[in-house]
């Protein structure tokens, strides 16, 4: 268990032409708040799919009123971190969605109005317990700068928050090979039984039965030194058998384009098509410097002393990508059948099967629902040999692939106003009512049970929505 923490540094116009209009005006002052949605893995999921790792909502920022004629500045931000607690192991790879919402504070009938200003998304690799990672994302003409980290909650420790701390058995020191559990100096790491034969000098484990190699070593038991002297070229993907680096066949081998850029060969070399927010020959320039710590998984950052010069991450064995964020992908052969999720554990590949399938490669069909995929968080319901999809709020149709208006069923009681939200819906309640769907009459203490708005309550206070 642990907590993912997100710190928003700034939200404002991005560089370049076409600066956005200020979202607030003298007639309609407004304030911002942010929502973060986390999902495990690196899958390209729809924004509407559940935030399986969790979600969090910020407080609202200070009220902002545009100065007439002035360009939109960085907008005032809410105080504090956004915290997303996770109960189980930290997955290491995750997808995020960060939304910037605007609350208009004019005299709307029925309370404040909200609108989505910007949504950014990305996929990252992150070890728990590491330093803050900084990031810049652009959405249209807006730019969002933020930092994030994952930390374990005691007694969990380790990069996945799976190792546990235990009280010391001896008062003076921990047992052989066991370290004190910082910051709980009076406790020791509980011993782990690694994979049988795993090199005690060059291997380690964070889960029982695992054998992960220190830099410079490879092989299932971390007993094979990585050698580059007999290799032909320092370019190309790592060979799992020899530990050598083998040459690639063309200029786009290994995709020289950083930050998700796509590579196309040209008569003389290659050309990168960069995603929004990145530029340069290899899409390597993003305004982030080595001082921001952009290299993951122990990667070494070189260059990039100022935002206009590129940084390069030199990755340790087993990782690749412009920020060393990608593990060398042995799952690309798609060994898992029936939509199973492939997990590269270092020493082995494992398939995590979808509901209704089993077996080492998810090859066994278990039940009626097995061949039936319900999209967008829908669940398959069996019954008498037949099956159907019970769709999540906001979706409909036979396989839950059709967008439905979650507000169409008028879920907000007592005149509450409904707003669609990417993970459900929110109700802004009429004065005198409360609850997720405005189903409760407000009862002031020491008064009758007639609905009444308590002093200072703004109906549908969006600071609460999570």
């Amino acid at each position: 268990a642990g907590v993912f923490e997100l710190q928003i540094h700034s939200f404002g116009p991005g560089p370049g032409p076409g600066a956005p209009r200020s979202p607030c005006s003298a007639r309609l002052p407004c304030r911002l708040f942010f929502r973060v949605c986390l999902k495990p893995g690196l899958s390209e999921e729809a924004a509407e799919s559940p935030c399986a790792l969790g979600a969090a909502l910020s407080a609202r920022g200070p009220v902002y009123t545009e100065q007439p004629g002035a360009p939109a500045p960085d907008l005032p931000l809410p105080d504090g971190l956004l915290q997303v607690p996770f109960r189980d192991a930290w997955p290491g790879t995750f997808s995020f969605i960060i939304e910037t919402w605007r609350e208009e504070l004019g005299d709307q009938i029925g309370g404040p109005a909200w609108s989505l200003l910007a949504r950014v998304a990305g996929r990252r690799r992150l070890a728990a317990g590491g330093p803050w990672a900084r990031d810049i994302q652009r959405a249209g003409a807006w730019e969002l700068r933020f930092s994030y980290r994952a930390r374990c909650e005691p007694p969990a420790v380790g990069t996945a928050c799976t190792r546990l701390c235990r009280p010391r058995s001896a008062p003076s020191r921990c047992g052989p090979g066991l370290r004190p559990c910082a910051p709980l100096e009076d406790e020791c790491e509980a011993p782990l039984v690694c994979r049988a034969g795993c090199s005690p000098e060059h291997g380690f484990c964070e889960q029982p039965g695992e054998c992960r190699c220190l830099e410079g070593w490879t092989g299932p038991l971390c007993t094979v030194p990585v050698s580059t002297s007999s290799c032909l070229s320092p370019r190309g993907p790592s060979s799992a058998t020899t530990g050598c680096l083998v040459p690639g066949p063309g200029p786009c081998d290994g995709n020289p384009c950083a930050n998700g850029g796509s590579c196309s060969e040209t008569p003389r070399s290659f050309e990168c098509t960069c995603p929004r927010g990145f530029y340069g020959l290899r899409c390597e320039v993003s305004g982030v410097t080595c001082a921001d710590g952009p290299c993951f998984n122990g990667g070494l950052c070189v260059g990039g002393a100022d935002p206009d010069s590129a940084y390069i991450c030199h990755c340790p064995p087993g990782f690749q990508g412009s920020n060393c964020e990608k593990r060398v992908d042995r799952c690309s052969l798609q060994p898992c059948r029936n939509g199973g999720l492939c997990l590269d554990l270092g020493h082995a590949l494992r398939c995590r099967c979808r509901a209704g399938f089993a077996g080492p490669r998810c090859e066994h069909d278990l039940d009626d629902c097995a061949g039936r995929a319900c999209a967008n968080g829908g669940t398959c319901v069996e019954g008498g040999g037949a099956h159907r999809c019970s769709c999540a709020l906001g979706f409909g149709g036979r396989d839950c692939r059709e967008r439905a208006d979650p507000c169409a069923a008028r879920p907000c009681a007592h005149g509450g106003r409904c707003y669609a939200h990417f993970s459900g819906l929110v109700c802004a309640c009429a004065p005198g009512y409360m609850g997720a769907r405005c189903e409760f009459p407000v009862h002031p203490d020491g008064a009758s049970a007639l609905p009444a708005a308590p002093p200072g309550l703004r109906p549908g206070d969006p600071q609460r929505y999570l």
């Epitope: 879920p411 409360m434 609850g435 997720a436 189903e439 409760f440 200072g456 309550l457 609460r464 929505y465």
Partner: antibody, heavy 123, light 107 residues
């Protein structure tokens, strides 16, 4: 770790009042409603009321109106439930439980519960 | 208020068998129905919300179905740890109400 931690067991005399606390940690306190549910020995679950930690507004089950008061302290992320004019049939385990504010998600129902506080009313 | 009636009151089954628990509402609860599991001396634990969506960390042997007034909780293959009391709860309208519970015991 997301949790709700409740105060310890209480023994009260008929006619007295009891105040049970529920401290939230691991989530944004003002982003979830807190409900109170009680369970008499060997019986089922009975909903008592709801409080919104953000604005402090609350709503009570009709059965408890006039006897129950729910309050919150945002500085300590704690919600309180006070029940007055106690009688023997109020002997029960009192639970707090959280509910999210976006309809259609897990938090739509009571996804996290406190460990319960046993209140015994006896002369 | 919406009255929820669970049946049967007690269900005696063996591990490995399939369990089907019913919850009937006196008026429509739409799909705002949850199922909880409670073991002696413990707080209830959320299994199903929205009538058919599994809560985080709940094994896929648990499934819920129904809408309106008739709801079902199905446990496809009973494990020893599944023997407990199960409650349905409607959160469609105030006041929220619970069923009286179904005790699932080992045969």
């Amino acid at each position: 770790q997301v949790q709700l931690v409740q105060s310890g067991a209480e023994v009260k005399k008929p006619g007295a009042s009891v105040k049970v606390s529920c401290k939230a940690s691991g989530h944004i306190f003002i982003s979830y409603y807190i409900h109170w549910v009680r369970q008499a020995p060997g019986q089922g679950l009975e909903w008592m009321g709801i409080i919104d930690p953000s604005g402090g507004s609350k709503s009570y089950a009709q059965k408890f109106q006039g006897r129950v008061t729910m309050t919150r302290d945002t500085s300590t992320s704690t919600v309180y439930m006070e029940l007055s004019s106690l009688r023997s049939e109020d002997t029960a385990v009192y639970y707090c439980a959280r509910q999210g504010m976006i309809v259609g998600t897990t938090g739509d129902a009571f996804d996290i519960w406190g460990q319960g506080t046993m209140v015994t009313v006896s002369s | 208020e919406i009255v929820l009636t669970q049946s049967p009151g007690t269900l005696s089954l063996s591990p490995g068998e399939r369990a089907t628990l019913s919850c009937r509402a006196s008026q429509s609860a739409s799909s705002y129905l949850a199922w909880y599991q409670q073991k002696p001396g413990q707080a209830p634990r959320l299994l199903i919300y929205g009538a058919s969506s599994r809560a985080t960390g709940i094994p896929d042997r648990f499934s819920g179905s129904g809408s309106g007034t008739d709801f079902t909780l199905t446990i496809s293959r009973l494990e020893p740890e599944d023997f407990a009391v199960y409650y349905c709860q409607q959160y469609n309208s105030s006041p929220y109400t619970f069923g009286q519970g179904t005790k699932l015991e080992i045969k």
